[in-house]
C-alpha cells in the first residue's frame, strides 16, 4: 500500500519564494508523519522536512540551507519556501512517511514539481555563499 | 537466518561518548518492510526504546533520549549505529538491536546485547 | 507518553499451573480493528524474545500454551499449562504511538 501525492507540475516563484502544496490520498489528521521536500531529479537535496505528531506542535527545519516553513492540512501539507535563488530552479518532489500509528507508509514516487525562480536576483553575500549549483 | 550482533560496548567515562554497532544479517535494512530499533536495560530494570531507523533512512528517536542520541547505518556493511553522548552513570545499561516489521512493529528479532557501564 | 503497567510484579507457580499476567494501558492502543500491544518473554542473561504479537497472534516457534487476548488498554497473557523452561520474566509492549513503551515486567517464579 502507498500513499499517493499531487503536486502542481510548474510553480513559478516571481518574488524568491513560493508555496508548494503536497496533496496525499491519506488523511494525516493523529497521524505521526515525516513530510519532506527534495530537490532535483534524484532527490539528492533534502530541502525542508516537517515532523507531524498528534500531541506536538508541527517541527519544521532544513539542514541544507533553505527558508522554509510549513502547514498541515488533513491530507496535504504546504511547503513555504523563500529567498530562493534563481540557480535553485529545479524539479522538487514531495515525499511522505508515515510512522505511527503502524503499519508504516509512504508514497509512491510523485511527478514533481517544476519551480522556476524569476525576480530579483538574490546575491548571496560573500560570506554566506547560496548553495552552489549540483 | 535472521541475525543481529551488537558490538562496541565497555567502560566508559561519565562525559564521554559510545557508539556501538549491530551487524545485521538475513535481511538488508534498505529494504522495505522491516526496520531497526534501539533498546536498552539498566542492570535489573525494564527495556527502555530509544529509538529506530527505517528502510529510507529516516530515523525516530526517545523525546527523553533525543538531544543525545543518533542512530545511522552503512548500507554497504548492513550495520546500523548508535552514538549516545555526554554519558552519564543513568546510561549503564544492556544495549540491544532489533527488528521490527512495518505491520504491527513488534520486535522480532534481537540481538544478544552490548554492556556499556559509565563509571569514572 | 503511554503507560503500560503489568501486574502482578512477580508470582510463584508451580510446573502445570495456569498463569495469567495482566497488561493496563493508560489509553487505548487499538487502531482500525487491531491491537498494536505485544508480548516478550527474558530470561537472565538473554534478549527478550517475541511470544505475541498484536494482542493475540502467536510469533512464529512459540509454544501453543502461549496465547494473549484483549483490546483497547486491557490485556492478559496466559500460560496454559506452565512449564520449566518458562520461568522468566514477561514484559508487554504497546507500538501504537511513539514513544514505544514496555510495561515494567513480570517476573513467574518458582514455588
Known amino acids: 500500500n502507498k500513499i499517493l501525492v499531487k503536486q502542481s507540475p510548474m510553480l513559478v516563484a516571481y518574488d524568491n519564494a513560493v508555496n508548494l502544496s503536497c496533496k496525499y490520498s491519506y488523511n494525516l489528521f493523529s497521524r505521526e508523519f515525516r513530510a519532506s521536500l527534495h530537490k532535483g531529479l534524484d532527490s539528492a537535496v533534502e530541502v525542508c522536512v516537517v515532523y507531524g505528531n498528534y500531541s506536538q506542535q508541527l517541527q519544521v527545519y532544513s539542514k541544507t540551507g533553505f527558508n522554509c516553513d510549513g502547514k498541515l492540512g488533513n491530507e496535504s501539507v504546504t511547503f513555504y519556501l523563500q529567498n530562493l535563488y534563481v540557480n535553485q530552479t529545479d524539479i522538487y518532489f514531495c515525499k511522505i512517511e508515515v510512522m505511527y500509528p503502524p503499519p508504516y507508509l509512504d508514497n509512491e514516487k510523485s511527478n514533481g514539481t517544476i519551480i522556476h525562480v524569476k525576480g530579483k536576483h538574490l546575491c548571496p553575500s560573500p560570506l554566506f555563499p547560496g548553495p552552489s549549483k549540483p | 537466518e535472521v541475525q543481529l550482533v551488537e558490538s562496541g560496548g565497555g567502560l566508559v567515562q561519565p562525559g564521554g561518548s559510545l557508539r556501538l554497532s549491530c551487524a545485521a544479517s538475513?535481511?538488508?535494512?534498505?529494504?522495505?518492510?522491516?526496520?531497526v530499533g534501539w533498546i536498552r536495560q539498566a542492570p535489573g530494570k525494564g527495556l527502555e526504546w530509544i529509538g529506530e531507523?527505517?528502510?529510507?533512512?529516516?530515523?525516530y528517536y526517545n523525546p527523553s533520549l533525543k538531544s543525545r542520541v543518533t542512530i545511522s547505518r552503512d548500507n554497504s556493511k548492513n550495520t546500523l549505529y548508535l552514538q549516545l553522548n555526554s554519558l552519564r552513570a543513568e546510561d549503564t545499561a544492556v544495549y540491544y538491536c532489533?527488528?521490527?516489521?512495518?505491520?504491527?512493529?513488534?520486535?522480532?528479532?534481537w540481538g544478544q546485547g552490548t554492556l556499556v557501564t559509565v563509571s569514572s | 507518553d503511554i503507560q503500560l503497567t503489568q501486574s502482578p510484579s512477580s508470582l510463584s507457580a508451580s510446573v502445570g499451573d495456569r498463569v495469567t499476567i495482566t497488561c493496563r494501558a493508560s489509553?487505548?492502543?487499538?487502531?482500525?480493528?487491531?491491537?498494536?500491544l505485544h508480548w516478550y518473554q527474558q530470561k537472565p542473561g538473554k534478549a527478550p524474545k517475541l511470544l505475541i504479537y498484536?494482542?493475540?497472534s502467536l510469533q512464529s516457534g512459540v509454544p501453543s500454551r502461549f496465547s494473549g487476548s484483549g483490546s483497547g488498554t486491557d490485556f492478559t497473557l496466559t500460560i496454559s499449562s506452565l512449564q520449566p523452561e518458562d520461568f522468566a520474566t514477561y514484559y508487554c509492549?504497546?507500538?501504537?504511538?511513539?514513544?514505544?513503551?514496555f510495561g515494567q515486567g513480570t517476573k513467574v517464579e518458582i514455588k
Open positions: 532489533a527488528r521490527y516489521k512495518y505491520d504491527y512493529y513488534d520486535f522480532d528479532y
Open positions: 538475513g535481511f538488508s535494512l534498505s529494504t522495505s518492510g522491516v526496520g
Open positions: 531507523i527505517y528502510h529510507s533512512g529516516s530515523t
Open positions: 509492549q504497546q507500538s501504537y504511538r511513539s514513544p514505544r513503551t
Open positions: 489509553q487505548s492502543v487499538d487502531f482500525h480493528g487491531i491491537s498494536f
Open positions: 498484536a494482542a493475540s
